[in-house]
């Protein structure tokens, strides 16, 4: 096994707001990550960088620094929030996300996350990519892995 294992668990919550004038959607997406330290000593998680893509366009980025210290043979669950904006050339989504005649306004987003840890004289980076459903029509709290989008063309990593 890797000395450090990173597992993207899923979307924990998505909080939505709109700007009707600009036909813009603001989504604050909180994701959950499990980081396991298989070393015999504590390891520093130096940073987590994340970005969210919609339709191959980056709609949000986030970076967390000096996250945590993980003890030997231990695991920590970390939540991180990526503020996203769906606007401009994607403002057509405003109509879909605010449509009252449908209950669930799921869109497919690609979550990318890179975890950087200090390990044996160098910084080790571990990346994960996952497609997830997010409801852009209301504030939603998800059961972990509930929002997973299974796409045979994009198998889980």
């Amino acid at each position: 096994p890797r000395s450090i294992e990173v597992k993207y668990i899923g979307v924990k919550s998505a909080y939505v707001s709109y700007d009707a004038e600009k036909r813009t959607i603001y989504l604050n997406i909180t994701n959950t990550l499990n980081i396991t330290n298989n070393n015999y000593y504590s390891v520093e998680v130096e940073n987590i960088t994340a970005q969210v893509q919609f339709s191959k366009t980056v709609i949000g980025k986030a970076r967390l620094n000096n996250i945590t210290n993980i003890g030997p043979l231990d695991m920590k669950q970390i939540d991180y929030t990526v503020p996203t904006v769906i606007a401009e050339e994607m403002s057509y989504m405003y109509d879909f996300c605010t449509l009252l005649s449908i209950k669930v306004h799921n869109i497919v987003l690609m979550m990318q996350v890179t975890v950087t840890t200090a390990y044996f004289g160098h910084s080790e980076q571990i990346s994960q990519e996952r497609y997830q459903y997010v409801d852009c029509g209301r504030n939603t709290t998800y059961q972990l892995a509930q929002s997973e989008y299974l796409n045979v063309l994009q198998p889980q990593q």
Partner: antibody, heavy 120, light 112 residues
Framework: QVQLQQSGAELIRPGTSVKVSCKAS????????IEWVKKRPGQGLEWIGV????????NYNEKFKGKATLTADKSSSTAYMQLSSLTSEDSAVYFC?????????????WGQGTTVTVSS | DIVVTQTPLSLPVSFGDQVSISCRSS???????????LSWYLHKPGQSPQLLIY???NRFSGVPDRFSGSGSGTDFTLKISTIKPEDLGMYYC?????????FGGGTKLEIK
């Protein structure tokens, strides 16, 4: 004071399994790792594996994967090692020891050892 | 796996002698944070192994100062300055940095 009290000697038939216990006292059980070590007559010490009792995460010597299973019960501050499909090669004294998370102290306190004899 | 080579296999001594035991690892035992997990143990027949030295050179509580450890990276030494009867037994080094932990083959300290 720190103590690791191991279960008593076992005489086991080949092909069966045995579970050795290691009860910790005198310190915070989940703040230390528990190591397991094998000693056969005329041979050196052999490291089997280690468990973090807080997380339940284990790491094994490749040689003992499938042979030893390490678990821990936080409520009773007891670590366990189950040995399966026993053969005469598994006849040995098995020790548990604790290791500090924070410092470089590995296996500072040891149990008294449990003798496992595999014989028909 | 890290190979830990201990020499000599056997060490015949007289009481009062000073002796050295060597332990060499196939890879550096110093991790990213500068810690080196190298320990020394004495195992006497019918007893549990006892920790003598941890982190290369730190004497464990209650261990007499005639025991000392030194070294860095891949080469380590245990010195016993004045051998006493209670020092006889098997000495082992253990590397605790890399997965899996590995013991040296042992050095038997015995009377000439």
């Amino acid at each position: 004071q720190v103590q690791l009290q191991q279960s008593g000697a076992e005489l086991i038939r080949p092909g069966t399994s045995v579970k050795v216990s290691c009860k910790a006292s005198g310190y915070a059980f989940t703040n230390y790792l528990i190591e397991w070590v094998k000693k056969r007559p005329g041979q050196g010490l052999e490291w089997i594996g280690v468990i973090n009792p807080g997380s339940g995460i284990t790491n094994y010597n490749e040689k003992f994967k499938g042979k030893a299973t390490l678990t821990a019960d936080k409520s009773s501050s007891t670590a366990y090692m189950q040995l399966s499909s026993l053969t005469s090669e598994d006849s040995a004294v098995y020790f548990c020891a604790r290791s500090d998370f924070i410092t470089t102290v590995v296996a500072d306190y040891w149990g008294q050892g449990t003798t496992v004899t595999v014989s028909s | 796996d890290i190979v830990v080579t201990q020499t000599p296999l056997s060490l015949p001594v007289s009481f009062g002698d000073q002796v050295s035991i060597s332990c060499r690892s196939s890879q550096s035992l110093t991790n990213y944070y500068g810690n080196t997990y190298l320990s020394w143990y004495l195992h006497k027949p019918g007893q549990s192994p006892q920790l003598l030295i941890y982190g290369i050179s730190n004497r464990f509580s209650g261990v007499p100062d005639r025991f000392s450890g030194s070294g860095s990276g891949t080469d380590f030494t245990l010195k016993i300055s004045t051998i006493k009867p209670e020092d006889l037994g098997m000495y082992y080094c253990l590397q605790g940095t890399h997965q899996p932990r590995t013991f040296g083959g042992g050095t038997k300290l015995e009377i000439k």
